[in-house]
């Protein structure tokens, strides 16, 4: 249950996360399972531990083996195992099955291919994408953040897709590649003008000064997997990232849910340590897709403090 397979190619960066989770205040120790020898935390080492992460910069075939991570809370130790295999680079174009990440499916409306494990790395856009070892070119292919979007997907688009990016650690650059299969499926779905389920239009949300508050923007866009659908928050008509208030943040990543077969997204706006001036702002929940944009406005009002422990 608490063991995880990880793999990589020699001379590339590989970063592995401990399969056991914890709190930021917990310490994590890493060991070579066979020898029980502690893995150093100093970054000058080629292989070193950094909290929940074990870093091979770069990896070598001899690094293959089982690594133990122990997440130490004050009263309990949680043990996990990372089974790491480092392979020699192939001279030909074929990517063997043992180097493949999970297969993803796409359709005409949704053709996002996420680059596997990329969230573990310190990388900067753009990603490079290859299909069957050929660099992808043409307007149909768009590298966006950590995924590839293919317009007007056809059955011929099925195949093995490789993302390539650079991991930066203390000014040194390391290459990383990851490959996964993409299959194309027919989908009977439709898209609608966005319908915002929450918040209600002109809703007044009661908050307590000094406490944290969450606002959820939730909207549905049709049936089946949707292409180009998004929900987001604006403050006084400005994007959250441009507003410049670090206490107010959107939850990273949009949660996709299928309620009664409908494709819905939600985005949580987190306000830390609510202040008086937050009550003066206009909070707009925006839902948009190819059909257009819908906006619901929320305002905050002060709630009389009550015992929040009850």
């Amino acid at each position: 249950k608490f063991s995880k397979q990880s793999w990589g190619l020699e001379n590339e960066a590989l970063i592995v996360r401990c399969p056991r989770q914890g709190k930021p205040s917990y310490t994590v120790d890493w060991y070579y399972s066979q020898t029980n020898k502690s893995i150093p935390t100093q970054e000058r080492n080629r292989v070193f531990a950094s909290g929940q992460l074990l870093k091979f910069l770069p990896a070598a075939v001899a690094d293959s083996g089982i690594y133990t991570c122990i997440v130490r809370s004050p009263t309990f130790n949680r043990t996990g195992y990372a089974n790491v295999t480092i392979y020699k680079k192939q001279s030909d174009c074929n990517v063997p099955d043992y180097l493949m990440y999970s297969t993803v499916s796409g359709s005409e409306k949704n053709s996002k291919i996420y680059c596997p494990t990329i969230d573990l790395y310190n990388w900067t856009a753009p990603l490079e994408w290859f299909k069957n070892c050929q660099a992808l070119q043409g307007s149909r292919y768009r590298a966006h953040k950590s995924f590839l979007v293919i317009d007007n997907v056809m059955t011929e688009d099925a195949g093995d897709y490789t993302c390539k990016f650079i991991h930066n650690e203390n000014g040194a650059n390391y290459s990383v590649t990851a490959t996964r299969s993409f299959t194309v499926k027919d989908e009977q779905g439709f898209s609608l003008f966005p319908v915002i389920g929450a918040p209600a239009q002109n809703e007044i949300k009661e908050v307590e000064i000094g406490k944290n508050a969450n606002l959820t923007c939730s909207a549905c866009f049709g049936k089946g997997t949707q292409f180009l659908a998004a929900v987001l928050w604006q403050l006084n008509g400005t994007k959250i990232t441009d507003f410049g208030e670090p206490r107010i943040q959107q939850e990273e990543g949009q949660n996709q849910s299928f309620s009664n077969g409908l494709a819905c997204l939600d985005m949580v706006l987190r306000i830390a340590d609510v202040k008086e001036e937050d009550l003066l702002l206009q909070y707009d929940c925006l839902a948009l897709n190819l059909h257009g944009l819908r906006r619901h406005t929320v305002r905050l009002s002060r709630k009389n403090p009550i015992d929040h422990h009850s």
């Epitope: 056991r20 914890g22 709190k23 205040s25 310490t27 809370s73 004050p74 009263t75 309990f76 422990h309």
Partner: antibody
């Protein structure tokens, strides 16, 4: 908004088993770092920690009571259940459930408590 | 078990004055440079309410009149200035070792 609410019998007979349910909202017990614990307080006395359960199903018990306690969670129902066997009149107390949140391990939100009397 | 001894058992303070409650642990409650000691306020008929966590951090929404200090084995809760609605029992609690333990409580009264 985080809330916790205890439910269970108000009166149990000696030797019987007490089952208490904590129903919570405003957080998920599948979130890394979260826990829910049980604490009791006999009338006019100090608080006594009984047990807690973590997001990854790690369970910790008060060694003095471990043989009598079982704690379980149902993440989908947002519930934590504590059972205590072989009840005795000295177990008469208000029983609280509380959340363990934050970056460190401590009870940050408490339920209102439920009073349990052990008497024949 | 880590035994927490609070003193005094009770104290009476005039409004506007300072109240100081101490908690001594039978062994250190330090973990990775952090003191795992909390303070709770409990009013009659109510559940405990978190005031201070990891020795000196004031919980969100708690008035700045409450402060905590200390490390290792000796900890202090200070209320300055005391107000009439601070009448309550105050408990310290450690989460360094299982079983988590509480102090026996200090009853604060207003003169």
């Amino acid at each position: 908004q985080v809330t916790l609410k205890e439910s269970g019998p108000t009166l149990v007979k000696p030797t019987q088993t007490l089952t208490l349910t904590c129903t919570f909202s405003g957080f998920s017990l599948s979130t890394s770092g979260m826990g829910v614990g049980w604490i009791r307080q006999p009338p006019g006395k100090a608080l006594e920690w009984l047990a807690h359960i973590w997001w990854d199903d790690v369970k910790q018990y008060n060694p003095a009571l471990k043989s009598r306690l079982t704690i379980t969670k149902d993440t989908s129902k947002s519930q934590v259940v504590l059972t205590m066997t072989n009840m005795d009149p000295v177990d008469t107390a208000t029983y609280y459930c509380a959340r363990i949140g934050g970056d460190y391990d401590y009870f940050d939100f408490w339920g209102q408590g439920t009073t349990v009397t052990v008497s024949s | 078990d880590i035994v927490l001894t609070q003193s005094p058992a009770s104290l009476a303070v005039s409004p506007g004055q300072r109240a100081t409650i101490t908690c001594r642990a039978s062994e250190s409650v330090e973990y990775s440079g952090t003191s795992l000691m909390q303070w709770y306020q409990q009013k009659p008929g109510q559940p405990p309410k978190l005031l201070i966590y990891v020795a000196s951090n004031v919980e969100s929404g708690v008035p700045a009149r409450f402060s905590g200090s200390g490390s290792g084995t000796d900890f202090t809760l200070t209320i300055n200035p005391v107000e009439a609605n601070d009448i309550a029992n105050y408990f310290c609690q450690q989460s360094r070792k299982v079983p988590w333990t509480f102090g026996q409580g200090t009853k604060l009264e207003i003169k």
